[in-house]
Interface confidence: low
């Protein structure tokens, strides 16, 4: 089946700057600003456009060693990024893939809202484990806040 989870979170960082840092340069930023969550991001195949495969490795002690993400769409105009988790991590006997959509929307106060959609494609009639969704949400929040802190501390970066 397909299970859809949608969440929203806010940031004080303007949409364009956040998209540039969090989405377009996350591969470099995440291991730097959140080494406790991501140990490395390796480009396996492609140039960042659709079809690009990235291997994200987690630190020692994590339940999963790595995941492989496939870039689906990068919309620079609307600050939208779609990617799928296709291997490693929770992908396996019960879960086929996770399709994710992140859209960063500017807010009147100069900050932004991140609208996140996660579609879990389970095999057969398996259901999604609640702790899986929770862990994924927490990881996203950890990375976002780490990037946000970095941007606040480095006002000249990603402008």
């Amino acid at each position: 089946g397909v299970f859809n989870y949608e969440t929203e979170t806010t940031s004080v960082i303007p949409a364009a700057r956040l998209f540039k840092a969090f989405i377009l340069d996350g591969d470099n930023l995440f291991p730097k600003v959140a080494p406790q969550a991501i140990s490395s991001v390796e480009n396996i195949e492609g140039n960042g456009g659709p079809g690009t495969i990235k291997k994200i490795s987690f630190p020692e002690g994590f339940p999963f060693k790595y995941v492989k993400d496939r870039v689906d769409e990068v919309d620079h105009t609307n600050f939208k990024y779609n990617y799928s988790v296709i291997e490693g991590g929770p992908i396996g006997d019960t879960l086929e893939k996770i399709s994710n959509e992140i859209k960063i929307v500017a807010t009147p106060d100069g900050g932004s809202i991140l609208k996140i959609s996660n579609k879990y494609h389970t095999k057969g009639d398996h259901e999604v484990k609640a702790e899986q969704v929770k862990a994924s949400k927490e990881m996203g929040e950890t990375l976002l806040r780490a990037v946000e802190s970095y941007l606040l501390a480095h006002s000249d970066a990603y402008n």
Partner: antibody, heavy 125, light 110 residues
């Protein structure tokens, strides 16, 4: 291993009917659009019909509208093509094909990435 | 219907030499999302077709890097940098907006 296996082809008289089946294995059928593509021996490829993941949308080439019906049973990982009013020009090898769209972005597309080996339909008196 | 026209229809090539196949569409395949909805498929003798290139220029998984796709709008090209004996077969372009195939190009070894 990701695989599609067609069955149900055979010899039928003009005006007759056949039901083709396609068994999917190695992946979850409900996550993908599916299509039927046919090929007349020694000729090119012609798309016949396609169906959305949940079966809510179906599209057909003009020449088979009203005669062919595409359907699916995701619980059984199966795709079907019901063909009635068969004509000599429907004689072909029929392929079951997976179309990889990303669920989170319905317009995004990865090609017809898995093909079955085909089943032969012959319409002749 | 969107008509797809391929050329040449027959392509004899010496192993190790490059080869290119042209595909022209009756209308633009450039989607509003910025991608060209044009695929290339290869049907080897006695086999089912296999996907080579999707969205005009993206190589499918497992396809050797000697294959590349280029073009935009209505004019597209499939290039093979160095043809190998295993590349023989019929190459089809296909527009993925309404799923129409070109008539095919038969690549054979000289």
């Amino acid at each position: 291993e990701v695989q599609l296996v067609e069955s149900g082809g055979g010899l039928v008289q003009p005006g007759g009917s056949l039901r083709l089946s396609c068994a999917a294995s190695g992946f979850t059928l409900s996550s993908y659009w599916m299509s039927w593509v046919r090929q007349v021996r020694g000729r090119g490829l012609d798309w016949v019909a396609k169906i959305k993941e949940d079966g809510s949308e179906k599209y057909y080439v003009d020449s088979v509208k009203g005669r062919f019906t595409i359907s699916r049973d995701n619980a059984k990982n199966s795709l079907f093509l019901q063909m009635i009013g068969l004509r000599a020009e429907d004689t072909a090898v029929y392929y079951c094909v997976r179309a990889d769209f990303t669920a989170a972005a319905g317009t995004f597309y990865y090609g017809l990435d898995v093909w079955g080996h085909g089943t032969t339909v012959t319409v002749s008196s | 219907d969107i008509v797809m026209t391929q050329s040449p229809l027959s392509l004899p090539v010496t192993p190790g030499e490059p080869a290119s196949i042209s595909c022209r569409s009756g209308q633009s395949l450039l989607h509003r999302n910025g991608y060209n909805y044009l695929d290339w498929y290869l049907q080897k003798p006695g086999q089912s077709p296999q996907l080579l290139i999707y969205l005009g220029s993206y190589r499918a998984s497992g396809v050797p890097d000697r294959f590349s796709g280029s073009g935009s709008g209505t004019d597209f090209t499939l290039n093979i940098s160095r043809v190998e004996a295993e590349d023989v077969g019929i190459y089809y372009c296909m527009q993925a907006l309404r799923y129409t195939f070109g008539q095919g190009t038969k690549l054979e070894i000289k």
